[in-house]
Amino acid sequence: KKVVLGKKGDTVELTCTASQKKSIQFHWKNSNQIKILGNQGSFLTKGPSKLNDRADSRRSLWDQGNFPLIIKNLKIEDSDTYICEVEDQKEEVQLLVFGLTANSDTHLLQGQSLTLTLESPPGSSPSVQCRSPRGKNIQGGKTLSVSQLELQDSGTWTCTVLQNQKKVEFKIDIVVLAFQKASSIVYKKEGEQVEFSFPLAFTVEKLTGSGELWWQAERASSSKSWITFDLKNKEVSVKRVTQDPKLQMGKKLPLHLTLPQALPQYAGSGNLTLALEAKTGKLHQEVNLVVMRATQLQKNLTCEVWGPTSPKLMLSLKLENKEAKVSKREKAVWVLNPEAGMWQCLLSDSGQVLLESNIKVLPTWSTPVQP
C-alpha cells in the first residue's frame, strides 16, 4: 500500500493510473466504500462523502489513463485509505495528514518559550525534527519546546515530520520581539546634545503599546521616570515628561529621544521598557550616558567623567602632539601648573578613543579658553 503524507490546510494529489492510455471509467472511494468521485463519460461525478466540495480531479489527464484525486484544504480527519477502482483493479493509497502549530502567537517576546505541537492521525507514530534559523536542531514527539528565545531565533523554523520513511516539511515563521541591542552607551562632552535611539529588531504591520524611560543618575539616590509615551500604529505620542531634563521624543519609529544637554547630573543608566498590546511581558533596552568635563581652576587642570564606565577605561590628559601627562583607570585626572597650549582629555578603551574634550590653557597671566 502506497503511503502519502499531507499537511493540514494544504492540497494533496493521489495518483491512479490505468494501463490503457485513454479515458475509462474510474471511482475513488474511502475505506468505508463511500464514493468520493468518479467519471461519467468525460464528466466528473461526486459521491456523498464528507470531502464533497474539497475533492476534485484533473480531467485533462483522463485521456492518458491518469485519474488523480485532489483533496484541498486537508484536515487531520482526512487521514484514511483511499481506493481507486479502475479496469477491475484496486489501487490503495494511505493518506496521513499532519498539522504543526505554534502553541501561542508566533510573535513572542525575547526570553519567552516557544512550543510547537504536532497534530497527527490516530495510530501514527511520527517523529519531528525542527531547525531554527540559527541552525539549532531540536527533536521531539507530539510537542517540541524551546525556552528562552533569543533574537537570532527570529525567522523561519523548518520542521520535518517523519512517518513510514516518508517525510513532510513544515515552515513556521517566528518573530522574536526585541530591541536590536540589549544595551547601548553614549559618550558626550558636557553641554552637547544627546541622541538616544531604540531600534526594534522586528517589523509588524501595526504596533501598539506604551513605554517608559526610567533613569538612575549616578549622583541620585533613586531612579526617576523621565518620560512615558504611547505607541499607536507606529505613531509615538508623549504622555508625560519630567521638567528636568526636558526630553524630546520623535513621533515615528524607531523610538528616538533627545536630551538637549549632557550634564554631569544626568550621567547614569536608563531602562526603556515597551509593553506591547496583547502581549504579556515587556521589551527592555538599557541605555547609558557618560559625560566628560575638562576645567581649569587656578593652577589645576582637571578632567572628569561621570556615568557607568568600565574599570578598564583609561582617562588621560595630554598636551596636543605630546605624550600623556597623566593616564589613570579612574574617573578624574588632573595636572598641576599645566603648560600653555591645547590640552586634550581622552577617555579610551584599549587605545580606542571613546570621548575627547579639548581645553586651551593660556599663559599664566590670562584665563583659560574652552573651544
Epitope: T11, R58, R59
Partner: antibody
C-alpha cells in the same frame, strides 16, 4: 464549435465598477469550470478568477481578492466578472477562458478579449 | 505563488528553423505545464498540456518536454503561421501563473 464572446469592457474612472460578460456556445457550459484571464499592456498574461462548474467554489489571486467577483448563470450559458474599486493597474484586455474540465485543469478555449481601461 | 521564468523573451527565426523555448518554475510543478500560442486580436490557443500532451488538431512539429522545474517547447520546423507569441502556464496549484512570453519573429 466552442465559442466564447466577451462584452462589457470600456473606459472607467479609478474607484469605479464594471461588469464583464462572456457568452458561451458550442459545448455543455454547466459541465466546465470557467475563468477570467487578463493581459495588461506590455505585461504577461495573469489569471484573475475561476469558478467551478456549478458555482460551488470560486478562486482569486490576492491582487483582485475582495474587489472582483466571478459568477455564472448556467441557464443562460453566461459567465460574469463584477469588478469594483478599479485601479489604473486593472487596465488590460480581459479574456474569458474555459477550463479543460475542473478547477485544476488548464484553459483549453479562450475568447478574443474585451478591453478595460481605468483612467481619470 | 509559483514564478515562471520564460526565455528568450523574443527570437528571430526563418521558416524551417528549429525553435526552442524554455520555462523555469520557481519550484517543482510536477509536469503541470501548458503551452499557448497567441496572435494579435485573438485569444491564446492551447498547444500542449501536461508537459508533452499535444492538443487535438495541433501539428506534430510542436512538442514539449521537461520535468521538475525545467520545461521546453520545441517547434521542429518553423512554418509561416507559427510566427506569434508563446506562453507557458503552470497549473500545479490553483494560483495559475504564466511565463513572460516569447515573441517569435521572422528573421
Amino acid at each position: 464549435e466552442v465559442q466564447l464572446v466577451e462584452s462589457g469592457g470600456g473606459l472607467v474612472q479609478p474607484g469605479g465598477s464594471l461588469r464583464l460578460s462572456c457568452a458561451a456556445s458550442g459545448f455543455t457550459f454547466s459541465n466546465y469550470a470557467m475563468s477570467w484571464v487578463r493581459q495588461a499592456p506590455g505585461k504577461r498574461l495573469e489569471w484573475v478568477s475561476a469558478i467551478s462548474d456549478h458555482s460551488t467554489n470560486t478562486y482569486y489571486p490576492d491582487s483582485v481578492k475582495g474587489r472582483f467577483t466571478i459568477s455564472r448563470d448556467n441557464a443562460k450559458n453566461t459567465l460574469y466578472l463584477q469588478m469594483n474599486s478599479l485601479r489604473a493597474e486593472d487596465t488590460a484586455v480581459y479574456y474569458c477562458a474555459r477550463k479543460y474540465g475542473g478547477a485544476y485543469d488548464p484553459f483549453d478555449y479562450w475568447g478574443q478579449g474585451t478591453l478595460v481601461t481605468v483612467s481619470s | 505563488d509559483i514564478q515562471m521564468t520564460q526565455s528568450p523573451s523574443s527570437l528571430s527565426a526563418s521558416v524551417g528553423d528549429r525553435v526552442t523555448i524554455t520555462c523555469q518554475a520557481s519550484q517543482d510543478i510536477n509536469n503541470y505545464i501548458a503551452w499557448y500560442q497567441h496572435k494579435p486580436g485573438k485569444g491564446p490557443k492551447l498547444l500542449i498540456h501536461y508537459t508533452s500532451t499535444l492538443q487535438p488538431g495541433i501539428p506534430s512539429r510542436f512538442s514539449g518536454s521537461g520535468s521538475g522545474r525545467d520545461y521546453t517547447l520545441t517547434i521542429s520546423s518553423l512554418q509561416p503561421e507559427d510566427f506569434a507569441t508563446y506562453y507557458c502556464l503552470q497549473y500545479d496549484n490553483l494560483l495559475f501563473t504564466f511565463g513572460g512570453g516569447t515573441k517569435v519573429e521572422i528573421k
